[in-house]
Structures are given as structure tokens and as C-alpha cells.
């Protein structure tokens, strides 16, 4: 008799989901050096903890303590490089930028990246078929409560001046309802973070307006400011030249406005 | 699946250069790297050199300032510019395609790479 399985709205779990997990872990602690200690299996273990036989809409971070223990990872907290809507090219930066960090540069945020996951409750099986969407399931789920915990803890973790990429091309330059505005933005600890400084990139190769003056980032100014924190913005008018400076600065155009 | 094919290898006299290519069916993309591996007899399997899609190179430190890893993306090619080789050089060269999304590592059959003194 075919057991009757919850039906949700968002996508299930990535295929190959525990062998990606895994491999990612391994592949991780390899190119870093300084995580070699971390025993990927146990890694697994804690991670699959946090969500196999729970209902996916009754996630807590409290599931998730297990592994973020087992993922602690020292990065330099004046290093730290935010994203909201612009993940690649935040992405890109680092991998040229070596010394700066977006969450996903960190091994818990390397593993987890663009993959989705869910279990069942009262079963020790992966849900496959089906995973709760944020908005018309629940917010609780997997991997909503994932990313809200490494993302406050990664905000905690902030000193000196933070910088964020945002996306100038969205209607919403600085949205409150994405990670950013809603979880990162209300943990940067103001008697450690200095400034935060916005990079909103431009999509358009015309587009010349100051993008610092949108609504939405005089929002995000008044929010930062009444947390003790300094707030700049600079426009990133071509981000293609921008990543060429960042590799090549010695370059004789590169010392004009990007 | 990720094809790989590496050629180049060969027998050397030490002080001598060697140039590995391996071709990927994929290119390198976002998080997904190339790079060679090598394998001496009775000894495991060691990084050399790896490069990421912008040209983020790394190096084992036995080969650093004598061996260099380029990429032709246009090709989908890695290559290894092997220089002042040393009999301790001397295993079989393995081309590796690390595939972020996959969570998967393919590899190329190997190619010999021999050192004589």
C-alpha cells in the first residue's frame, strides 16, 4: 500500500543530495588547509540531524546548533562581504578579492549553496518529490531556517567596515524582506561594526544615475544609522570593469571611476 | 558526465620541460575547477595545481616556481607547463574536473610523466 506523502509547493530535495553534502565537505576541507580537522561524516551526521523525521515546517535554528558547532570557522571579521540579489557576482569578487568572504566562502554556506532539502516527520526518509516553499507552505522549513542561522551568526561575526553588494538593476535596491534586510542587517553588532558600506552595481552600460540617492537605500541608511552604525554607498556604474580592476589594478584604466 | 582527455606526457631528462593538456567536454564555470593530480608508485594521490574559472590558481609547494597551470576557456583546456623537472616528478599525471553543483570529481585515464636523472 503506497504510503500518503505530504505534498508541498516548493521543489524536493536536490538529487543526490547526502553525496553532494558530502563531497562538497571533503572538496572544502581540501582547498582550505586551516579546516582539514573537520570530519566530513560527522558533518553529514549533524546536518541530516537537523532535519530528518522533523516535520519541514516545524524547523527550529535550535536543530541546526549540532552542525554549526561542527562548522566553526575563524574568518576575518573586517573581511566580510554581504550580498542580497547578486549572489554571482559577489561570488566572483572573492574568488579574485581572495582575502574577502561571502558566506557561502565558508564551509557551511559552500555546502549548502543552491541546494534544497527536507525530510519527513516520523520518517527517516529525504523527501525527493516535494519541500515547503517559504510563502505558501511555511517559513520554518529546512532550508529557510538554515540560511537565517548562518546568516545572523555570519553577521554577528562582522567588525570594522562590512560591505554589501546590491542589486541596482531591482526595483527594490535594498529589499527588507530578503536575508539581508531582515536577518544580516539586525546582527551586525554596532559595538564591533564600524561602517557598512553598500556597493549597489549597475546593470545598465548608460545608466549614470547615483543609484546611492534610490528611496530604498536612504531606507537602509536610516535603518544602519539608528543602530549606532556609519553607512556609505558607492555606485559600481560597470561591474565587468570593476572585477578586471580588482585583478589587474596596476592597469591603467582602472584608476578611473568603475 | 564530465569527458576528460589529457595528453603531453613523456619521458624527460631532469632539468627538462614538459606541457600536459587535458580537454573537458564542460567549460570552467562558477564554483567548478580543473586541475592535475599525480601519482607516484606505492604513494597516494596529490594535488599539483588547480585553477578556477577566473584564473585563481593554486599550487602544491614542491612545484611552485617550476610548474604552471593556464586555462583556455574558449577550448574548455587546462594546461600544465612543467619546467626544471626533477626525478621526484616522476608518477602519473591525472587531470581533475571538480563540478561545485555536482558534488562530483571527474578524471581523466592519466598520463606518464617520467624523470630520468
Known amino acids: 500500500v503506497p504510503r500518503w506523502r505530504q505534498q508541498w509547493s516548493g521543489p524536493g530535495t536536490t538529487k543526490r543530495f547526502p553525496e553532494t553534502v558530502l563531497a562538497r565537505c571533503v572538496k572544502y576541507t581540501e582547498i582550505h588547509p586551516e579546516m582539514r580537522h573537520v570530519d566530513c561524516q560527522s558533518v553529514w551526521d549533524a546536518f541530516k540531524g537537523a532535519f530528518i523525521s522533523k516535520h519541514p515546517c516545524n524547523i527550529t535554528e535550535e536543530d541546526y546548533q549540532p552542525l554549526m558547532k561542527l562548522g566553526t570557522q575563524t574568518v576575518p571579521c573586517n573581511k566580510i562581504l554581504l550580498w542580497s540579489r547578486i549572489k554571482d557576482l559577489a561570488h566572483q569578487f572573492t574568488q579574485v578579492q581572495r582575502d574577502m568572504f561571502t558566506l557561502e566562502d565558508t564551509l557551511l554556506g559552500y555546502l549548502a549553496d543552491d541546494l534544497t532539502w527536507c525530510g519527513e516527520f516520523n520518517t527517516s526518509k529525504i523527501n525527493y518529490q516535494s519541500c515547503p516553499d517559504w510563502r505558501k507552505d511555511c517559513s520554518n522549513n529546512p532550508v529557510s531556517v538554515f540560511w537565517k542561522t548562518v546568516s545572523r551568526r555570519f553577521a554577528e561575526a562582522a567588525c570594522d567596515v562590512v560591505h554589501v553588494m546590491l542589486n541596482g538593476s531591482r526595483s527594490k535596491i535594498f529589499d527588507k524582506n530578503s536575508t539581508f534586510g531582515s536577518v544580516e542587517v539586525h546582527n551586525l553588532q554596532p559595538e564591533k561594526v564600524q561602517t557598512l558600506e553598500a556597493w549597489v552595481i549597475h546593470g545598465g552600460r548608460e545608466d549614470s544615475r547615483d543609484l546611492c540617492q534610490d528611496p530604498t537605500i536612504k531606507e537602509l541608511e536610516s535603518i544602519i544609522s539608528k543602530r549606532n552604525i556609519q553607512f556609505s554607498c558607492k555606485n559600481i556604474y560597470r561591474p565587468d570593469k570593476f572585477l578586471q580592476c580588482v585583478k589587474n589594478p596596476e592597469d591603467s584604466s582602472c584608476t578611473s571611476e568603475i | 558526465e564530465v569527458q576528460l582527455v589529457e595528453s603531453g606526457g613523456g619521458l624527460v631528462q631532469a632539468g627538462g620541460s614538459l606541457r600536459l593538456s587535458c580537454v573537458a567536454s564542460?567549460?570552467?564555470?562558477?564554483?567548478?575547477?580543473m586541475g592535475w593530480y599525480r601519482q607516484a608508485p606505492g604513494k597516494q594521490r596529490e594535488l599539483v595545481a588547480r585553477?578556477?574559472?577566473?584564473?585563481?590558481?593554486n599550487y602544491a609547494d614542491s612545484v611552485k616556481g617550476r610548474f604552471t597551470i593556464s586555462s583556455d576557456n574558449a577550448k574548455n583546456t587546462v594546461y600544465l607547463q612543467m619546467n626544471n623537472l626533477k626525478p621526484e616528478d616522476t608518477a602519473v599525471y591525472y587531470c581533475?574536473?571538480?563540478?561545485?553543483?555536482?558534488?562530483?570529481?571527474?578524471w581523466g585515464q592519466g598520463t606518464q610523466v617520467t624523470v630520468s636523472s
Open positions: 585553477i578556477a574559472s577566473l584564473g585563481i590558481t
Open positions: 581533475n574536473y571538480w563540478h561545485y553543483a555536482a558534488g562530483r570529481d571527474y
Open positions: 564542460e567549460r570552467i564555470f562558477s564554483r567548478n575547477t
